[in-house]
């Protein structure tokens, strides 16, 4: 008995072929002798199954003494034994119909976890193995969970179900809702407009939710919301903003918000939330601000940086063009009785500069002058 | 609901080969037979062969010796090379999909075979 | 190979009118028969199928009759949006093949 795997929703085609090259009477029959269709003459002719609106063939086909069962919209249901009666003799065929679903909705929030059932016909026993985006397989019997899913989860789950040595393959759009960054960090002398941009790893037609910009800064003993804001339809409208700082927002994606100035009282870390509608969850994305400033107070020229930067980070000031004369692994440094010229105040990693702020030391009668 | 998206060469010297791909979104692949059928600029329809997912083929004799038809299940897609063109295989080229009517239609490409 | 005629080449008729368009096959093809609707520029539409089973979406305006060799496409009250070619198509062998085309035009 041959045996054909078919996904529900799908269109099979169950094959039958007579030795003569030519249109004959066939006819095709359930497992309880239904009659499902076949000809007469040249007409196509269809019995009292439940299969009737769904079931078809091709009359091209008959005349090469081919006689299909063409099965549209599959269902779990519609496995069961076909006979093919052509030429006085009977061919058989077994179909069996699976289906793969997820168990919700395909769009997860990064974090969560995806449960994937298969419907199978009474009297299988079907191995599934899935293979996620990143090559991670994972195999199963009726359900396949994956917990966690990350951002590189998003994209398409290819699901091989095997039944009989035969194969059914499922394909699986999944979509994790996620920032495209976990965390971000931006570097501004003080006085600078700073931007922070919040794209997400995702595009759909409809984006609604609402989110929240909580501010940790390094000078304050707790933290506070610095704007709350709504998202409809992938525009964006503030709800609530505070006076200090009065933060301004893009009206459009990807979330956009702009600080007037870098000042050391604003320096800390930041955790943009965002709830989106119909999902359970938040998005997150940690936004951290480093701010420096450079001056020179009497004989002293000082260069300080706040927030949050890790210690391998070094701290340098230097005259332009000179070795540096001063280099610590700390956040503030300092140099007394500076040269007249152009200093230079770095904040480098491993050599790469992240920022640079430079203040002009005039000879000692002058006052300085920062540009 | 079931898309065909078709795309190729619109321009083409005598003697090239005519090469178009069909890519087929939401819906099934197996169990249908995907056609390709042409128009020359305003005449007729005319129907050059077809294919199902297993690879099995169809073609119209008149054009028999000069077509293949292929198929890549893994994209869903399926394919057309005419070899030899002259300037009476310009024509809009559609893909279709069938079993025994041709429903749906792709967008339709236009071929001009000139030297 | 079977071949399709259609007649009449071309028609014009009003909005509100009954149009006939016959499709003819040079040998029986029971009723394995298509009728197309295409406009300027864009591919066929399927109406009918199986001679005269209206596809789902099409307005019930339209309708097919005929088995054998002799086949017919109505159109019980014609609208604005029916202006175009028909195509007949016999699906009962290989190769398939479509009548020459019946255009539908305003009086």
């Known amino acids: 008995k041959k045996v054909v795997l078919g996904k529900k929703g799908d269109t099979v085609e169950l094959t039958c072929t007579a030795s003569q090259k030519k249109s004959i009477q066939f006819h095709w029959k359930n497992s309880n002798q239904i009659k499902i269709l076949g000809n007469q003459g040249s007409f196509l002719t269809k019995g009292p199954s439940k299969l009737n609106d769904r079931a078809d063939s091709r009359r091209s086909l008959w005349d090469q003494g081919n006689f299909p069962l063409i099965i549209k919209n599959l269902k779990i249901e519609d496995s069961d034994t076909y006979i093919c009666e052509v030429e006085d003799q009977k061919e058989e065929v077994q179909l069996l119909v699976f289906g793969l679903t997820a168990n919700s909705d395909t769009h997860l929030l990064q974090g969560q976890s995806l449960t994937l059932t298969l419907e199978s016909p009474p009297g299988s026993s079907p191995s599934v193995q899935c293979r996620s985006p990143r090559g991670k397989n994972i195999q199963g019997g009726k359900t396949l969970s994956v917990s966690q899913l990350e951002l590189q989860d998003s994209g398409t789950w290819t699901c091989t179900v095997l039944q009989n040595q035969k194969k059914v393959e499922f394909k699986i759009d999944i979509v994790v809702l996620a920032f495209q960054k976990a965390s971000s960090i931006v570097y501004k002398k003080e006085g600078e407009q700073v931007e922070f941009s919040f794209p997400l790893a995702f595009t759909v037609e409809k984006l609604t939710g609402s989110g929240e910009l909580w501010w940790q800064a390094e000078r304050a003993s707790s933290s506070k919301s610095w704007i709350t804001f709504d998202l409809k339809n992938k525009e964006v409208s503030v709800k609530r903003v505070t006076q200090d700082p009065k933060l301004q927002m893009g009206k459009k994606l990807p979330l956009h918000l702009t600080l007037p100035q870098a000042l050391p009282q604003y320096a800390g870390s930041g955790n943009l939330t965002l709830a989106l509608e119909a999902k359970t969850g938040k998005l997150h994305q940690e936004v951290n601000l480093v701010v420096m400033r450079a001056t020179q107070l009497q004989k002293n020229l000082t260069c300080e940086v706040w927030g949050p930067t890790s210690p391998k980070l070094m701290l340098s000031l230097k005259l332009e063009n000179k070795e540096a004369k001063v280099s610590k692994r700390e956040k503030a440094v300092w140099v007394l009785n500076p040269e007249a010229g152009m200093w230079q105040c770095l904040l480098s990693d491993s050599g790469q500069v992240l920022l640079e702020s430079n203040i002009k030391v005039l000879p000692t009668w002058s006052t300085p002058v920062q540009p | 609901q079931v898309q065909l998206q078709q795309w190729g060469a619109g321009l083409l010297k005598p003697s090239e080969t005519l090469s178009l791909t069909c890519a087929v979104y939401g819906g099934s692949f197996s169990g249908y037979y995907w056609s390709w059928i042409r128009q020359p600029p305003g005449k007729g329809l005319e129907w050059i062969g077809e294919?199902?997912?297993?690879?099995?083929?169809n073609y119209n004799p008149s054009l028999k010796s000069r077509v293949t038809i292929s198929v890549d299940t893994s994209e869903n897609q399926f394919s057309l090379k005419l070899n030899s063109v002259t300037a009476a295989d310009t024509a809009v080229y559609y893909c279709a999909r069938l079993v025994n009517w041709f429903d749906p239609w792709g967008q339709g490409t236009l071929v001009t075979v000139s030297s | 190979e079977i071949q399709m005629t259609q007649s009449p080449s071309s028609v014009s008729a009003s909005v509100g009118d009954r149009v006939t368009i016959t499709c003819r096959a040079s040998?029986?093809?029971?009723?394995?028969l298509a009728w197309y609707q295409q406009k300027p520029g864009k591919a066929p539409n399927l109406l009918i199928f199986?001679?005269?089973s209206l596809q789902t979406g099409v307005p019930s305006r339209f309708s097919g009759s005929g088995s054998g060799t002799d086949f017919t496409l109505t159109i019980s009250s014609l609208q604005p949006d029916d202006f175009a070619t028909y195509y007949c198509q016999q699906a009962n062998s290989f190769p398939y093949s479509f009548g020459q085309g019946t255009n539908l035009g305003i009086k």
């Open positions: 199986a001679a005269s």
């Open positions: 040998q029986d093809i029971s009723n394995w």
């Open positions: 294919i199902n997912h297993s690879g099995s083929t």
